[in-house]
Interface confidence: low
């Protein structure tokens, strides 16, 4: 019988001077057998909660509590979620400045409103800190003799162009 730690299974530890595979104590784990010590399980507390509990062979995994999201590998930090209309800065959640918006809950940055005129369109609905502007249909250019009437159709926001 090979008297070494090489045959130890995960979930155990083994000391070279006394090469016997021993179970990891509670709240410790060993994903590789034959190591001289088991590792202390990660504790998910405070802003963290358990995503996966610790076992003898794998560490606990944490996730952030409601209102926070993970940062870094293995969710090493929790960052506060911002509301729509805000973005996270070093000073915390800040309201989007005029002309910008963020429609995401928790993450994202404030982005500039769409410039409707670049597409030759009019602004149908003004933007807010939470919503982008809504662009209307393209502005059609006609000869001076053409009369244009905009007739509402299908309730608010529904428009058709008729050339009379």
């Amino acid at each position: 019988v090979q008297n070494s730690c090489d045959n130890c299974q995960p979930g155990t530890f083994c000391r070279k001077y006394n090469p016997v595979c021993k179970s990891c104590p509670p709240s410790t784990f060993s994903s590789i057998g034959g190591q001289p010590n088991c590792n202390i399980c990660r504790v998910c507390a405070g802003y963290f909660r358990f995503k996966k509990f610790c076992s003898s062979t794998h560490n606990a995994e944490c996730e952030c509590i409601e209102g926070f999201h993970c940062l870094g590998p293995q969710c090493t930090r929790c960052e506060k979620d911002c509301r729509p209309g805000q973005e996270l800065t070093k000073q915390g959640c800040k309201t989007c400045s005029l002309g910008t918006f963020n429609d995401q809950n928790g993450t994202g940055v404030c982005r500039p409103w769409t410039n409707c005129s670049l597409d030759g369109r009019s602004v149908l609905k003004t933007g807010t800190t939470e919503k982008d502007v809504v662009c209307g249909p393209p502005v059609v250019s006609f000869s001076p003799s053409t009369t244009i009437s905009v007739t509402p159709e299908g309730g608010p926001g529904g428009h058709s162009l008729q050339v009379l």
Epitope: S23, C24, P25, P26, S27, T28, I40, C41, R42, V43, C44, F50, K52, F53, C54, S55, S56, T57, H58, A60
Partner: antibody, heavy 126, light 106 residues
Framework: QVQLQQSGAELVKPGSSVKISCKAS????????LHWIKQQPGNGLEWIGW????????YYNQKFNGKATLTADKSSTTAYMQLSSLTSEDSAVYFC???????????????????WGPGTMVTVSS | DTVLTQSPALAVSLGQRVTISCRAS??????MHWYQQKSGQQPKFLIY???NLESGVPSRFSGSGSGTDFTLTIDPVEADDIANYYC?????????FGSGTKLEIK
Amino acid sequence: QVQLQQSGAELVKPGSSVKISCKASDYTFTSNFLHWIKQQPGNGLEWIGWINPGDGDTYYNQKFNGKATLTADKSSTTAYMQLSSLTSEDSAVYFCAGGNYYAAHYPPGPWYFDFWGPGTMVTVSS
Amino acid sequence: DTVLTQSPALAVSLGQRVTISCRASKSVSIYMHWYQQKSGQQPKFLIYTASNLESGVPSRFSGSGSGTDFTLTIDPVEADDIANYYCQQSNELPFTFGSGTKLEIK
């Protein structure tokens, strides 16, 4: 109030296997470990092992390696223990037990059993 | 494995104070817990981590100790307390129980 319901008494022949069940109600089944404990007539208690129903992870008291197999079914919130190659030494009451504690603590533990099933009597006899 | 030693039986008069001891073969820090088991029933959890009373357990029960020596005290003893009492350690795997102490009435 957490309740653990166990299957009824079993009379089995030596060499055979038996599978007993433990159904959990009013219990965060996937977030708490479930333990199995043996009590021979007139004797003390022996911890067999645990199962984490969340991922099926198990840990056995070395004494029961190969004797007991622990499984769990998340959909029915039921844990099972199969005992194989039965002998008269396996005649006992088997309890399932749980605890309202997180699985990872430092310092160790507390790893106590604060609620228990009523037990299942297994009698091995020819 | 950590062996837990309990005296097999104790006789006590109702209304008196009784202490049930549990000695561990090596230090278990404060990770000792106590259970009560009445005949034909499942164990009932009483005390965790040496001295913390489980909610709903009468205050006449108390626990103390650390390292290797632990005690469960019942003061005063009532007729309803006649049962077996087990200690359990969770400092290392496998978890182990004491052999139990039977509380009897004088």
